[in-house]
């Protein structure tokens, strides 16, 4: 009889997580009598995966009937593969004894597990930033194997280039994680913008996974303020409006001050949205000119999204208001619109009437 050989025909087998793996092993002789054992890994720390003679291996079944006459096929079937099952599996023949004695090992079959990456999760900055500032977005995906993976960033469909990506761990592992941080420069038109993190992996069959974040969560567009006087009313009342425009988010409190004293406070709510996602709000204040001997200094004070208040003042000259006089003729806009960025639309920063 020929000398026993243990044949593992496949050097490697690749299986998708959740599927089953078949690891093939045949022996060339019925001699010596004794069991087959399957191990993951080699050397003293090897892990027993299947023992023909004894033990309970709920996920492992023998492919052929081990009780079959002349059986020389000791292939096994491992169900519900997970990334933790990756490794090199050895089919080892033992000679029966007390204890059984190892006779010969197969060359080994490397089992690699293809595991899909988790859905990418994109997180933005903890605090809002204004236009022309750079904010960072982070994208994370976990649990994939093999290690090779491609990650791309997009803003409104345009690919971004300013990002850094790390895949961990650097060495061999059963599964891997990816983390990427992209730097995005905000513009005031970004309320409706979106950043997309796209992950491509061999397990996804050309259909990449995407994670998104809305820049609306990251941006603050400070308001423009403009205070104007409307036409003089017949009953000696002056209508002054404070126009608060192009702001985001909606969270805004407006306070009218008359000569430094709080006259009225309002909170913005249920405002219609502009096309670009920003909001406008107009507040009116009726000033009874006849009740004042001196000029009235009106201040529109806006506190937007918890930021320091922005003021715009306007002087109503009482002496210049006979009952028949029209609007604007003797009113002076003395305030400035304090914004923390320049904008081409902002040509009316310092209007005087």
């Amino acid at each position: 009889e020929e000398e026993l050989q243990v044949i593992q025909p496949e050097k490697s087998v690749s299986v998708a997580a959740g599927d089953s793996a078949t690891l093939n092993c045949t022996v060339t002789s019925l001699i010596p009598v004794g069991p087959i054992q399957w191990f993951r890994g080699a050397g003293p720390g090897r892990e027993l995966i299947y023992h023909q003679k004894e033990g309970h291996f709920p996920r492992v079944t023998s492919v052929s009937e081990s009780t079959k006459r002349n059986n020389m096929d000791f292939s096994i079937h491992i169900s519900n593969i997970t990334p933790a099952d990756a490794g090199t599996y050895y089919c080892v023949k033992f000679r029966k004894g007390s204890p059984d004695v190892e006779v010969k090992s197969g060359a080994g079959t490397e089992l690699s597990v293809r595991a899909k990456p988790s859905a990418p999760v994109v997180s933005g900055p903890a605090v809002r930033a204004t236009a022309e500032h750079t904010v960072s977005f982070t994208c994370e995906s976990h649990g994939f194997s093999p290690r090779d993976i491609t990650l791309k960033w997009f803003k409104n469909g345009n690919e971004l280039s300013d990002f850094q990506t790390n895949v961990d761990p650097a060495g061999k592992s059963v599964s891997y994680s990816i983390r990427s941080t992209a730097r995005v420069v905000l513009t005031r038109r970004d309320v409706h913008s979106q950043v997309i993190c796209e992950v491509a992996h061999v397990t996804l069959q050309g259909d990449p996974l995407r994670g998104t974040a809305n820049l609306s969560e990251a941006i603050r567009v400070p308001p423009f303020l403009e205070v104007t006087q409307q036409s003089m009313r017949a009953d000696n009342q002056v209508n002054v409006t404070c126009q608060v425009t192009k702001f985001y988010p909606q969270r805004l409190q407006l306070t009218w001050l008359e000569n430094g004293n709080v006259s009225r406070t309002e909170m913005a709510s249920a405002l219609p949205e502009n096309k670009d996602g920003t909001y406008n709000w107009t507040s009116w204040l009726l000033v009874n000119v006849s009740a004042h001997r001196d000029d009235v200094k009106l201040t529109c004070q806006v506190e937007h999204d918890g930021q320091p208040a922005v003021n715009k003042s306007f002087s109503v000259k009482v002496s210049a208001h006979p009952k028949e006089q029209g609007s604007n003729t003797a009113a002076e806009n003395t305030g400035t619109n304090e914004r923390d960025y320049k904008d081409d639309d902002d040509k009316h920063h310092h209007h005087h009437h």
Epitope: E1, V33, K53, G55, S66, T67, N70, K96
Partner: antibody, heavy 119, light 110 residues
Framework: QVQLVQSGAEVKKPGASVKVSCKAS????????INWVRQAPGQGLEWIAM????????HYNQIFKDRATLTTDTSTSTAYMELRSLRSDDTAVYYC????????????WGRGTLVTVSS | DIVLTQSPDSLAVSLGERATINCRAS??????????IFWYQQKPGQPPKLLIY???NRDSGVPDRFSGSGSGTDFTLTISSLQAEDVAVYYC????????FGQGTKLEIK
């Protein structure tokens, strides 16, 4: 280590039945055939039958086909051999034996159960 | 059915001497490249013990003074140097088809 523990001695009257048990331990019961062999006093070995506990496939010696029935209980790793219509010449030691190499051989043996058939 | 005939029925050999037991099959027991013959030793009051499988392979723990040989229909169990503990009845068995045993050979010390 492999152990096959058989039930105790039985005394039966002619025409009765006997059921001998064989409890296996030290190995995966469903992976190996169990054989039954008997030996009459001062006589040689006589193969009765074999059973595969994984699927209850059986092979019988033609001499015993009509009188012997092999069964297993995988939950307790126990094999049974029932012999019906006992005669005085069925007096023998009945052995169970495990076939380790699926070679239809007998690698490990129980200690035997003496069945005496006498009126 | 294949019938196995052992010879001699009994044998007396001096300690340290060679003992030879023969087993002849009524037809060839060779199949798939193997000779399906097994040898057992049975001591008084004990169950049989497997010595040799597939004609020539010593089972685990069997002393190397025991050897098996032969092919086709004729097989031999040899004890190269008889020891006192080798006194027993020896049986051949085939499994070319369903198993059958030879009638046994009683080995004694001369």
């Amino acid at each position: 280590q492999v152990q096959l523990v058989q039930s105790g001695a039985e005394v039966k009257k002619p025409g009765a039945s006997v059921k001998v048990s064989c409890k296996a331990s030290g190995y995966t019961f469903t992976n190996y055939w169990i054989n039954w062999v008997r030996q009459a006093p001062g006589q040689g070995l006589e193969w009765i039958a074999m059973i595969d506990p994984s699927d209850s496939e059986t092979h019988y010696n033609q001499i015993f086909k009509d009188r012997a029935t092999l069964t297993t209980d995988t939950s307790t790793s126990t094999a049974y051999m029932e012999l019906r219509s006992l005669r005085s010449d069925d007096t023998a030691v009945y052995y169970c034996a495990m076939d380790y190499g699926s070679l239809y051989a007998m690698d490990y043996w129980g200690r035997g159960t003496l069945v005496t058939v006498s009126s | 059915d294949i019938v196995l005939t052992q010879s001699p029925d009994s044998l007396a050999v001096s300690l340290g001497e060679r003992a030879t037991i023969n087993c002849r099959a009524s037809q060839s027991v060779r199949s798939s490249g193997y000779n399906w013959i097994f040898w057992y030793q049975q001591k008084p009051g004990q169950p049989p013990k497997l010595l040799i499988y597939l004609a020539s392979n010593r089972d685990s723990g069997v002393p190397d003074r025991f050897s098996g040989s032969g092919s086709g229909t004729d097989f031999t169990l040899t004890i190269s140097s008889l020891q006192a503990e080798d006194v027993a009845v020896y049986y051949c068995q085939h499994s070319r088809e369903l198993p059958t045993f030879g009638q046994g050979t009683k080995l004694e010390i001369k």
